[in-house]
């Protein structure tokens, strides 16, 4: 099982994460919560932003949090604010960017509890035992040579959403990555939530398709923290 | 169309031994990964194993850990469960299923029937 | 031995909608945010009905709806007919014990 995983220190030195290729700057995944994958559906540059007015956390993108824009200004009027870097003040997790959390006030490396190691090695040792080596970035040769020939169809197995064919996505489920399909308007959709007391989520949705965003469903607001919904929703 | 067809099951005496097959056709078999999932008569279902793609991977349910071992032959398309030192309990029709999205495809099943 | 609880019979008449229940522990259901749905015809293998708590895969009715709230799934199956009488399971996946099976809901259909 994935707890005998947990307790394995086989793997150190990890590349990126496995499923985004690097260098680019989202993986392409929604991931759920306490994965510390970048990535999600609305990266925006400081040019382009649009305020977006929000009630939780969980209404913002990956490297947001929901706050008033002004210190000590009506709490009635929040907006997603971009997330605190490392070492900036912060009031709780979902405040610092992914990849870190709040401790003591300050945004932290979730490196420094380990926490992040522990979790790629989990991911690396359970779904990549027949995946990449280590060394640069290059394969072993488990896989069917004929995957690469053709592109993979839903459910079959993949390194990035590369591997898979149009409308799918390479995303981790139970002990393996697999090509799912992109979200479709009105399907459930996953936010990114840093918070690192999150357990190891592993299994994670596809992004929504094009001209869609995670949102909160409207009626959902009132709901507890633990059954909102989030679904695909037109821009 | 996808296929999965199971046999090798039967009778046997506990503490005896059994191996199952499953032949799969119909999809690129070395692109996924495998289960066995039993279902003693008139009860539920129970994920038994599962495996790897390549078959460097596998995962067992805590009942059956250290008698059962999965294994698959790419070149053969085929899923193989051997089981060791069979229990009363551990008859069933064992179903040999594709794990794409989900347990996606299921074979019709094999019944062991471990009994003296 | 964490478990996955659905009422052990539902039934309904033809035309009728019913819901099939599936509790779990944060652990599994509530936890993960992913449940599965099969179906069983008497001696029958099963068959994937809603993977992703509420996603059809293709060639399933859209009259096969699933739900999330909390700890429990539900499976909402609208219009009954007839063939639907089977027993549906629920399944999720559990870091400890791996995939993880409801005890199954035996569908009725009256008349």
């Known amino acids: 099982t994935l707890n005998s995983v947990l307790n394995s220190n086989a793997i150190k030195n990890l590349p990126p994460p496995l499923g985004g290729a690097a260098g680019h700057p989202g993986s392409a995944v929604s991931a759920a919560p306490g994965i510390l994958y970048p990535g999600g559906n609305k990266y925006q540059t400081i040019d382009n932003y649009q305020p977006y007015p929000c009630a939780e956390d969980e209404e913002c993108g990956t490297d947001e949090y929901c706050a008033s824009p002004t210190r000590g200004g009506d709490a009635g009027v929040q907006i997603c604010l971009a997330c605190r870097k490392r070492r900036k003040r912060c009031m709780r997790h979902a405040m610092c960017c992914p990849g870190n959390y709040c401790k003591n006030g300050i945004c932290v490396s979730s490196d420094q509890n380990n926490f992040r190691g522990e979790i790629e090695e989990t991911i690396t040792e359970s779904f990549g035992n027949d995946h990449s080596t280590l060394d640069g970035y290059s394969r072993r040769t488990t896989l069917s040579s004929k995957m690469y020939h053709s592109k993979g169809q839903e459910g079959s197995v993949c390194l990035r959403s590369s591997d898979c064919a149009t409308g799918l996505c390479c995303a981790r489920h139970f002990w393996s990555k697999i090509c799912k399909p992109v979200l479709k308007e009105g399907q459930v959709c996953t936010k990114h939530r840093r918070k690192g007391s999150h357990g190891l989520e592993i299994f994670q949705r596809c992004y929504c398709g094009e001209g869609l965003s995670c949102r909160i469903q409207k009626d959902h607001h009132q709901a507890s923290n633990s059954s909102r919904l989030h679904t695909c929703q037109r821009h | 169309q996808v296929q999965l067809v199971e046999s090798g099951g039967g009778l046997v005496q506990p503490g005896g031994s059994l191996r199952l097959s499953c032949a799969a056709s119909?999809?690129?078999?070395?692109?996924?990964?495998m289960s066995w999932v039993r279902q003693a008569p008139g009860k539920g279902l129970e994920w038994v194993s599962g495996?790897?793609?390549?078959?460097?991977?596998?995962h067992y349910a805590d009942s059956v850990k250290g008698r059962f071992t999965i294994s698959r032959d790419n070149s053969k398309n085929t899923l193989y469960l051997q089981m060791n030192s069979l229990r009363a309990e551990d008859t069933a029709v064992y179903y040999c299923?594709?794990?794409?999205?989900?347990?996606?495809?299921w074979g019709q099943g094999t019944l062991v029937t471990v009994s003296s | 031995d964490i478990a996955l609880t659905q009422p052990a019979s539902v039934s309904g008449s033809p035309g009728q909608s019913i819901t099939i229940s599936c509790t779990g522990t944060?652990?599994?259901?509530?936890?993960?945010?992913?449940v599965s749905w099969y179906q069983q015809h008497p001696g029958k293998a099963p068959k994937l009905m809603i993977h992703?708590?509420?996603n059809r895969p293709s060639g399933v009715s859209n009259r096969f709806s699933g739900s999330k709230s909390g700890n429990t799934a539900s499976l909402t199956i609208s219009g009954l007919q007839a063939e639907d009488e089977a027993d549906y399971y629920c399944?999720?996946?559990?870091?400890?014990?791996?995939?993880?099976f409801g005890g199954g809901t035996k569908l009725t259909v009256l008349g």
């Open positions: 495996i790897s793609y390549s078959g460097s991977n596998t």
């Open positions: 944060s652990s599994d259901v509530g936890g993960f945010n992913y």
């Open positions: 299923a594709r794990m794409g999205i989900d347990l996606d495809y």
């Open positions: 992703d708590g509420s």
């Open positions: 399944s999720t996946w559990d870091m400890t014990v791996d995939f993880v």
């Open positions: 119909g999809f690129t078999f070395s692109s996924y990964w």
